[in-house]
């Protein structure tokens, strides 16, 4: 299915991972301001804060040399984010391994800005993407991924960190957003909802998808995550929406089939290496991009977000497994682990394709309202 108001003929097309719908070439909301810790009442963003295990628990901070005390995302201070007052958030919260500053959760006290002031910044994530307002940037070339097809051995760590399920990635996964914009993948994690309630972090024209995958990367210009936090382009996240499709997604099944083993908060297991790229849409050329933040404390800004236009398809059973298997702290299910969308505050979302053209049945004469700011970057 397509995003709301997506062109019926938009070139979505299923991808290698069984994806099928591209984001409806819509525009990201072009305003994102101080992060709202709670979803505005009535909004679909049930939980009011982001959870980005991978973002907050950035995996090995220093992918280069694992011997050096690289900082892990999970070592970053985490905060409890107040959630939508109307949505009983799942209190998913985790004591970051004894870290005093690691208390935060979706929906509830303390407010995230109290845990990390950056969570009140003006350029936060996630945001609502409105394709019609996106600036088409021909300079945004297809993403390049190298080394993402991992062999079964060595195995990878899959962990329930209390606010998401996170897969720690080994050294060697390289990603380029463009010439001179090179990154190394650190970890990936997911955000989801609950029965009958979608749980993606980003939205498209207000439409929230069932779930969302985030693959967190560290710029090769930095050796450690803590050095990159808050630095423009220091971190980059590839995000893709997960939707319901008719068939089982075999790539995702390699992870979803193991969730029962890590149902308890803080538990982990090992899974065979897999083709990480198969978890993403097959079309690396059509995406939206903007500068935002981690969606969970510490909410550091300067993060380059790349949101695929094409979505990934999972079966209804798989989406149910994702949202109904894990437990967070306090005997509460780990669900609705997404942060409310944040104001763009003047930011312009760029698109690697003409997303605002013929993307909405309601727009008789689509007009590109914003111009590309990063041509040639």
């Amino acid at each position: 299915q397509r995003l709301p108001r997506m062109q019926e003929d938009s070139p979505l097309g299923g991808g290698s991972s069984g994806e099928d719908d591209p984001l409806g070439e819509e525009d990201l909301p072009s305003e994102e301001d101080s992060p709202r810790e709670e979803d505005p009442p009535g909004e679909e963003d049930l939980p009011g804060e982001e959870d980005l295990p991978g973002e907050e628990d950035l995996p090995e901070v220093k992918p280069k040399s694992e011997e050096e005390g690289s900082l892990k995302l999970e070592d970053l201070p985490t905060v409890e984010a107040p959630g939508d007052p109307q949505e009983p958030q799942n209190n998913a919260h985790r004591d970051k391994e004894g870290d005093d500053q690691s208390h935060w959760r979706y929906g509830g006290d303390p407010p995230w800005p109290r845990v990390s002031p950056a969570c009140a910044g003006r350029f936060q994530s996630p945001v609502d993407i409105r394709p019609q307002l996106a600036a088409f940037c021909p300079a945004l070339r297809p993403l390049e991924l190298l080394g993402f097809q991992l062999p079964p051995l060595p195995e990878l760590r899959l962990r329930n960190n209390g606010h998401s399920v996170q897969l720690t990635l080994p050294p060697g996964l390289e990603m380029a957003l463009g010439p001179g914009r090179e990154y190394r993948a650190l970890q990936l994690h997911l955000h989801w909802g609950a029965a009958g309630r979608p749980g993606s972090e980003h939205t498209v024209e207000g439409h929230r998808f069932p779930a969302e995958i985030h693959v967190v990367h560290l710029s090769t210009a930095f050796a450690r995550v803590d050095e990159a936090l808050g630095r423009p382009g220091g971190l980059a996240v590839l995000a893709a929406f997960l939707e319901e499709g008719p068939e089982e997604n075999s790539a995702y099944e390699q992870l979803l089939s193991r969730l029962e083993e890590i149902a308890e908060e803080g538990s982990e297991t090992q899974v065979p290496g897999l083709d990480i790229s198969a978890l993403l849409p097959s079309d690396f050329s059509r995406y939206f991009q903007y500068e935002g933040s981690l969606t969970t404390p510490p909410c550091a800004q300067g993060v380059i977000w790349t949101v695929f236009n094409q979505t990934v398809m999972l079966s209804a059973k798989q989406l149910h497994t994702l949202s109904d298997t894990l437990w967070g702290p306090g005997d509460s299910r780990l669900q609705l682990n997404f942060r409310a969308t944040q104001p763009l505050n003047g930011r312009v979302i760029e698109a690697s394709f003409p997303a605002g053209v013929d993307s909405s049945p309601r727009a008789a004469e689509p007009v590109q309202l914003n111009s590309c700011l990063a041509a040639g970057d």
């Epitope: 079964p152 075999s250 297991t269 090992q270 065979p272 290496g273 083709d275």
Partner: antibody
Framework: QVQLVQSGGGLVQPGRSLRLSCTAS????????MHWVRQAPGKGLEWVGF??????????QYSASVKGRFTISRDDSKTIAYLQMNSLKTEDTAVYYC???????????????WGQGTLVTVSS | DIQMTQSPSSLSASVGDRVTITCHVS??????LSWYQQKPGKAPKLLIY???NLHTGVPSRFSGSGSGTDFTFTISSLQPEDIATYYC?????????FGQGTKLEIK
């Protein structure tokens, strides 16, 4: 030379227990994951499970057919892998093979060294 | 679980013949497939790993190819001692699964 020598098979009644042992020699036992594979009379091969090495936390992995009933363990000091089989069923009757597979330097699970096999017959 | 389908389930060939066995996998396993030979009353022996790599000490008449979901095992010139049952096995993810086997006989 590299070899795996098995012991412990035999006839056992349904519902009872039995433990198989596999003694390794000729290679660095601690580097490898150790698996168990079985073969029912006249049938094909079925993977039972494995136990990881110390570097990977000694955690086991089992097939659905034996999970909760069988336990795989190892004693690195003696270079022995064990398969503890409880609540045995007649359908567990098979030749059980101890197998080496999954070295830190390999990139997937292939079974390059097999024990001679030991017959386990579950019958009343 | 990943399903492995071998074909044929049995075959008869003459000494010197070229013999081919195929293995179809229910999902993409890249090249993480192995082939084993098992003679009556004996433990299986690894012949081919990673779809096409010949295991140490295995005669060069044995070979393997393929990737993704379709794989082929070939004996370029059948020898009397090759009479056995051959199995394919996926090493992509657990539970590890084997094909049902192909019993090879001499005409």
């Amino acid at each position: 030379q590299v070899q795996l020598v098995q012991s412990g098979g035999g006839l056992v009644q349904p519902g009872r227990s039995l433990r198989l042992s596999c003694t390794a020699s000729g290679f660095t036992f601690t580097d490898y994951y150790m698996h168990w594979v079985r073969q029912a009379p006249g049938k094909g091969l079925e993977w039972v499970g494995f136990i990881r090495n110390k570097a990977s936390g000694y955690t086991p992995q089992y097939s659905a057919s034996v999970k909760g009933r069988f336990t795989i363990s190892r004693d690195d000091s003696k270079t022995i892998a064990y398969l503890q089989m409880n609540s045995l069923k007649t359908e567990d009757t098979a030749v059980y093979y101890c197998v080496r597979g999954g070295h830190a330097g390999s990139n997937y699970w292939y079974f390059d060294v097999w024990g001679q096999g030991t017959l386990v017959t579950v019958s009343s | 679980d990943i399903q492995m389908t071998q074909s044929p389930s049995s075959l008869s060939a003459s000494v010197g013949d070229r013999v081919t066995i195929t293995c179809h996998v229910s999902q993409n396993i890249n090249v993480w497939l192995s082939w084993y030979q098992q003679k009556p009353g004996k433990a299986p022996k690894l012949l081919i790993y990673q779809a096409s790599n010949l295991h140490t000490g295995v005669p060069s008449r044995f070979s393997g190819s393929g990737s993704g979901t379709d794989f082929t095992f070939t004996i370029s010139s059948l020898q009397p001692e090759d009479i056995a049952t051959y199995y394919c096995q996926q090493g992509q993810s657990y539970p590890f699964t084997f094909g049902q086997g192909t019993k090879l006989e001499i005409k």
